[in-house]
Interface confidence: low
């Protein structure tokens, strides 16, 4: 199994960024971290979504991976999509220094987010609890802004 | 490649304050990884550690514990330059003070870590005396 990960984040746009993944054992959580810059200061969602299809720029990507047919919810949440990872933050200067450790995506198995699509979204992840519809799929966090497919790293 | 070079070591007695200065130059703009800048000490006989790093393309802070209150890092990005504040000195705090740039995200457990940093400055002593 991969152990590593990376994604490079592109959008239309001046937001792009690295995003890594480790996981040291299977059955064990992965940590993220990296950065993204080129944002607007405060939360936006950060998801890993179905396809890594990047033909139409993000928007092929489909939507959040949600291989257990659950609603959208928080990281924490048991609630939840595999794909929700939440919301990074960006600082004044437009870059969000994200460290996440998630215990619900892998990096094999059956919740692998290897090949599928990283997106960082225009707005903050309401975490479904926005009390409509739309939050119950996507956390009303709006367009993408950036995003990339995960792929194995050395 | 950047280079780095810091200043403002010299000798002072405990529970007294010093400013460092790292100045980084040269090296290319990386299109999506912003470097990590960071102050290490050796002090004779003993191994290398990290004691503050920064991320230079935003505003995170990481502290090692035996600094943690007392030590503060922060960066001016126009002139380059990461500074240490170190107040409330102490004899252990004793050593030969580097700084160093990585120029990758850095997973958390390892920001302090020399093992990350790839760029290193030619180092500035700090005596503190009882």
């Known amino acids: 199994m991969a152990t590593k990960a990376v994604c490079v984040l592109k959008g239309d746009g001046p937001v792009q960024g690295i995003i890594n993944f480790e996981q040291k054992e299977s059955n064990g959580p992965v940590k993220v971290w990296g950065s993204i810059k080129g944002l607007t200061e405060g939360l936006h969602g950060f998801h890993v979504h179905e396809f890594g299809d990047n033909t139409a720029g993000c928007t092929s990507a489909g939507p959040h991976f949600n291989p257990l047919s659950r609603k959208h919810g928080g990281p924490k949440d048991e609630e939840r999509h595999v794909g929700d990872l939440g919301n990074v933050t960006a600082d004044k200067d437009g870059v969000a220094d994200v460290s996440i450790e998630d215990s619900v995506i892998s990096l094999s198995g059956d919740h692998c987010i290897i090949g599928r699509t990283l997106v960082v979204h225009e707005k903050a992840d309401d975490l479904g609890k926005g009390g409509n519809e739309e939050s119950t799929k996507t956390g009303n966090a709006g367009s993408r802004l950036a995003c990339g497919v995960i792929g194995i790293a050395q | 490649q950047v280079q780095l070079q810091e200043s403002g070591g010299g000798s002072v007695q405990a529970g007294g304050s010093l400013r460092l200065a790292c100045v980084a130059s040269?090296?290319?703009?990386?299109?999506?990884?912003?470097?990590?800048m960071g102050w290490y000490r050796q002090a004779p006989g003993k191994e290398r550690e990290g004691v503050a790093t920064?991320?230079?393309?935003?505003?995170?802070?990481y502290y090692s514990d035996s600094v943690e209150g007392r030590f503060t890092i922060s960066q001016d990005k126009a002139q380059r330059t990461v500074y240490l504040q170190m107040n409330d000195l102490k004899p252990e705090d004793t050593g030969m003070y580097y700084c160093?740039?990585?120029?990758?995200?850095?997973?958390?457990?390892?920001?302090?870590?020399?093992?990350?940093?790839?760029?290193w400055g030619p180092g500035t002593q700090v005596t503190v005396s009882s």
């Open positions: 920064i991320y230079t393309g935003g505003s995170g802070t």
């Open positions: 160093a740039a990585g120029n990758g995200a850095l997973p958390p457990g390892r920001r302090l870590s020399p093992q990350n940093m790839d760029t």
């Open positions: 040269g090296g290319d703009t990386r299109p999506y990884i912003t470097y990590w």
